[in-house]
Interface confidence: low
């Protein structure tokens, strides 16, 4: 018999063999980190001679070369030292930033083993346009430099590397890049476990928190979030068994599907577990059409008796028909409940597809995700309701540029990845749903329907009254503390006598709680400039109340994220190494940033925090104040960097009992607070008939309407004090 | 450019049954769905039902639950609506209109398709 | 079942700022469109989702929505403007359309 020669060692590496040296057999290099095999396989051909795949000569000598980095080809308004071609292992590039722009993202990134940087793209940006700079990763060249609403930029790779993310982003409405961003990586490149865990579980938490964002703890529970029964999730677990998996690694894909819905079923939300093996064929092993796949043991029974000798008559990879099995399911439900249902409307759905190689028969995957994405009407605003989670394990036939367009773009997000072999899977999927320390609610989750009380809007929303009138707001933060202002305090009321109104779904004048605790802070002293001529002090205006009980979380009442903390992080969809200064840098990215506050009749209205050089010119018109500050010769003393200002053109002014309330944003349907309302140039409610009424000030007003709230980012030592227990705080 | 093109004019007896066409074209069909709204002369508009390009499923307006029919062929990008039992009050202008999401309204119109009916 | 109202009819002269109402029980808390709809033509979407313009129609053309009531705003209204506007609004999977509000622009 037929037989290949053994001549076939690589320096510096080792080889496996499939099938030992007879025709048929595949050798497969592999070389010490650090260092990737040239060539990476060999195939042991019927005339008994090896095939290199893509070789030129018939047989080339492998060596186990050495891994780089690429190299930036652009770096917009900046420099980056050292220029080199590209970066050995361990190699490190430095960017700084021109004068008038900031640095976003890693100022240095290194070189890994796997052939990746670590870190994240540096950016040069002076905040100019409706979207943040998009940047240029290592390797890429953009085309497109207006950053305005609906204007695009297009991604390539130089050389030989291979695009992963979107080739083509456009800035939305929102300020958000459409897509993923883009990153060229080298063919032989492949991903770490603890870069996947954190990545595939940050965006799976967001798409958990989505199917119904209420959370409570349960401790028996070992402190796992629950998410209260009301949205649905399919999940659709499609498990490659095609020749070139051994029968160990299927073994290692059905575990690590286990570990997944073992995961998901803790989460206590309403799901269903589609589980599809294929090779040449699908084969349906559990339909989200069957009742059973919602119990958890059926599940795993099913898992556990998927035998890879289902596919032995046919060993191709039809990622297509795999695909297309999970449409007919979905097509079969929709009939089922009806299109236009909500019952269908509102399931998520999320597939996971576990591979070592690309499809080989069966026509284009690409045309069933766009069948899927079809009948799910996926699009800009439904884009929550699908995703595509592809995996490819062992770095051998796995094609980076399929897993990429397979895999969900969505901004900050990953849904591509390689991993080195089925060992790396096994632990990707044992800590990608460690929330175990997020013992908190979910926070900032608004509805955001037409229909939606101003409650249900912002359910962070509270009131804070002495005995008789009402006098300021406040900001849940967490199931028993609300942050304030420090003035609603300064008349040293015995905080006994006073309430703290809670939305209550049960009732339109919402819940009262009793303060367990008041925390003002010890810097607040609204005199303590007056022998400078300054009649009124505001900083450090920030207080914290301990409600003397729980608040049961529900859709009119719940926390609002506060940045710096991990609940914000995983709403914000950020990398797990994220620091206080990075949401700095994502939530004030702009010199004018659109952000709200909640008036006296609960309704949200609509600021720009002035930042930058802004900042400086809307501060400035406090100079013109004579009546509050009569000798004023520096700004600074009053408006000091704790605040942050808005009120210039078409700002809406808060009111004298809207104090404390928060400022917030929206970033990926969540709301984030970075303020608190605390002083201003004028009242719109003076003189006006009721609380649904406010006055714009007169455009000739001196001076102009000037609002001064107190920035989050600016206290966190303070809050860090105080919340120690209660948050979970980010590195600053 | 988008267009939705409809079938020409029809005159039909009452009792019988009429099947206009409109046929999609500069978009992706399968991607928006199509509506179908009348307009009695000189009268205002009213929504006939909705069918989903993709799947083929329908939601009819109340009124017509029993006489109509809205279909698609996929292949050809068309779109059709049947309506039977005809009366002289189904004397209209019939329109086609698609639309992305329901709040995104119908953004472009076919020219219409007038039905007499008539003895 | 639901119901839209609209005013039959509302005249002005060139460049004043027409305001078209149309009714319905909380119409605030959904979604409505506007159209336009000029004789022996189709109509033409110009508001949607309360008061978003699509790509082509003039910025004069504003709409708003609370409480009961939508209102479509032409501000410096041309000759051009003259047609019939209806308002449209889902309800249970169910689109309703207004009764229809003829603007006359008078010479």
């Known amino acids: 018999a037929t037989s290949c020669p053994q001549n076939v060692n690589i320096s510096g590496g080792t080889f496996t063999l499939s099938h030992g040296w007879a025709p048929g057999s595949l050798l497969i290099y592999s070389c010490p980190q650090g260092l990737y095999p040239s060539p990476a396989s060999r195939l042991c051909k019927s005339s008994g001679q090896w095939q290199t795949p893509r070789a030129t000569r018939s047989l080339t000598k492998a060596v186990c070369k050495p891994v780089r980095c690429p190299a930036p080809v652009s770096f917009e308004n900046g420099i980056y030292t050292p220029r080199l071609g590209s970066y050995p292992v361990g190699g490190n590039v430095s960017f700084e930033c021109e004068d008038g722009f900031i640095l976003r993202g890693s100022p240095v990134r290194q070189c890994r083993p796997n052939g990746m940087w670590d870190g994240e793209t540096a950016v040069c940006d002076n905040g100019a346009g409706h979207c943040p700079n998009p940047g240029i990763s290592l390797g890429a060249v953009r085309t497109g430099s207006r950053f305005g609403h609906g204007d695009k930029v297009r991604y390539r790779c130089s050389s030989n590397l291979v695009l992963t993310g979107s080739a083509e982003r456009e800035c939305q409405g929102n300020g958000v890049w459409s897509g993923t961003e883009p990153i060229c990586r080298q063919p032989y490149s492949y991903d770490f476990p603890e870069d996947v865990a954190p990545a595939l579980g940050t965006s799976f938490s967001h798409m958990l928190g989505a199917t119904n964002p209420t959370q409570r703890t349960k401790e028996s529970l070992g402190r796992k979030i629950q998410i209260q029964r009301s949205g649905h999730l399919n999940l659709y677990l499609l498990l490659d068994s095609s020749q070139s998996v051994s029968e160990n690694d299927f073994l290692i894909f059905k575990e690590s599907a286990s570990l997944m819905v073992d995961r998901i079923f803790s989460f206590e939300i309403n799901v269903s577990v589609a589980i599809i093996t294929f090779a040449s064929e699908p084969k349906v092993l559990m339909s989200v059409l069957n009742v059973n796949s919602r119990d958890i043991t059926e599940v795993i029974s099913s898992l556990e008796n998927a035998k890879y000798k289902d596919h032995e008559n046919g060993t191709g990879t039809n990622t297509y028909a795999a695909l297309n099995s999970v449409y007919l399911m979905m097509n079969n439900q929709m009939q089922l409940l009806g299109m236009k249902t909500m019952a269908w409307q509102e399931i998520r759905h999320a597939i996971i597809l576990l591979t070592d190689g690309k499809s080989n028969m069966g026509g284009s995957p690409k045309t069933a995700v766009d069948q899927i994405r079809e009948i799910l009407n996926i699009n800009q605003k439904r884009n929550d309701y699908l995703d595509i989670y592809a995996i490819g394990v062992g770095k051998l036939d796995v094609d980076w540029r399929e897993l990429n367009e397979l895999g969900s773009k969505k901004d900050g997000e990953r849904h591509a990845f390689i991993l080195q072999d089925t060992k790396a899977l096994h632990q990707v999927f044992e800590h990608m749903l460690d929330v175990s320390k997020l013992t908190d609610t979910i926070c900032g989750v608004g509805n955001m329907s037409a229909n939606a009380s101003d409650q249900e809007r912002t359910p962070w929303h509270v009131t804070i009254k002495p005995k008789s009138q009402e006098t300021c707001r406040g900001a849940l933060i967490s199931d028993q503390w609300v942050l304030t202002a420090a003035h609603c305090f300064r008349d040293g009321n015995d905080h006994s006598l006073w309430r703290v109104n809670v939305g209550d779904p049960k009732s339109q004048w919402g819940k009262e709680f009793l303060i367990e605790k008041a925390v003002i802070s010890p810097g607040f002293d609204v005199f303590a400039k007056k022998n400078q001529g300054i009649l009124e002090f505001y900083g450090d205006d920030i207080a914290l109340l301990k409600l003397a009980q729980k608040v049961k979380m529900s859709t009119h009442a719940r926390p609002i994220c506060l940045p710096c903390t991990m609940e914000a992080n995983l709403a914000l969809r950020r990398p797990q190494g994220s620091t206080c200064r990075d949401h700095e840098n994502e939530l004030l990215n702009k010199q004018s940033v659109p952000a709200h506050f909640v008036a006296l009749n609960g309704s949200k209205l609509n600021i720009n925090l002035k930042m930058g050089v802004e900042w400086t010119s809307c501060a400035e018109v406090v100079s013109q104040e004579k009546t509050m500050f009569p000798n004023l010769t520096d700004v600074r003393e009053v408006v000091t960097d704790q605040f942050l200002c808005s009120g210039t053109q078409e700002d809406e002014s808060p009111c004298k009992g809207e104090s404390g309330g928060a400022v917030f944003l929206e970033r990926r349907f969540r709301f984030f607070q970075v303020g608190l309302v605390s002083w201003g140039l004028y009242n719109p409610c003076l003189g006006s008939a009721d609380k649904n009424s406010r006055k714009r000030a007169p455009r000739s007003k001196v001076p102009p309407p000037r609002d001064f709230h107190i920035n989050l980012f600016r206290m966190q030592p303070w809050l860090r004090q105080h919340l120690g227990d209660v948050l979970n705080f980010l590195p600053l | 450019q988008v267009q939705l093109v409809q079938s020409g004019a029809e005159v039909k007896k009452p009792g019988a049954s009429v099947k206009v066409s409109c046929k999609a074209s500069g978009y992706s069909f399968t991607t928006y769905y199509m509506y179908w709204v009348r307009q009695a002369p000189g009268q205002g508009l009213e929504w006939m039902g909705i069918i989903t390009p993709s799947g083929g499923s329908t939601t009819y307006a109340q009124k017509f639950q029993d006489r109509v029919t809205m279909t698609r062929d996929a292949s050809t990008t068309t779109v059709y609506m049947e309506l039977s039992s005809l009366r002289s009050e189904d004397t209209a202008v019939y329109y086609c209109?698609?639309?992305?999401?329901?709040?995104?309204?119908?953004?472009?119109w076919g020219q219409g398709t007038l039905v007499t009916v008539s003895s | 079942s639901y119901e839209l109202t609209q005013p039959p009819s509302v005249s002005l002269s060139p460049g004043q700022t027409a305001s078209i109402t149309c009714s319905g029980d909380?119409?605030?808390?959904?979604?409505t469109c506007w159209y336009q709809q000029k004789p022996g033509q189709s109509p033409v979407l110009v508001i949607y989702?309360?008061?978003k313009r699509p790509s082509g129609i003039p910025e004069r053309f504003s709409g708003s929505n609370s409480g009961n009531t939508a209102t479509l705003t032409i501000s410096g209204t041309q000759a051009m403007d003259e047609a019939d506007y209806y308002c449209?609004?889902?309800?249970?999977?169910?689109?309703?359309f207004g009764g229809g509000t003829k603007l006359t622009v008078l010479g």
């Open positions: 209109a698609r639309g992305y999401e329901g709040s995104y309204g119908f953004d472009h």
């Open positions: 989702q309360d008061n």
């Open positions: 909380k119409l605030g808390n959904k979604y």
């Open positions: 449209q609004t889902w309800d249970s999977s169910t689109a309703v």
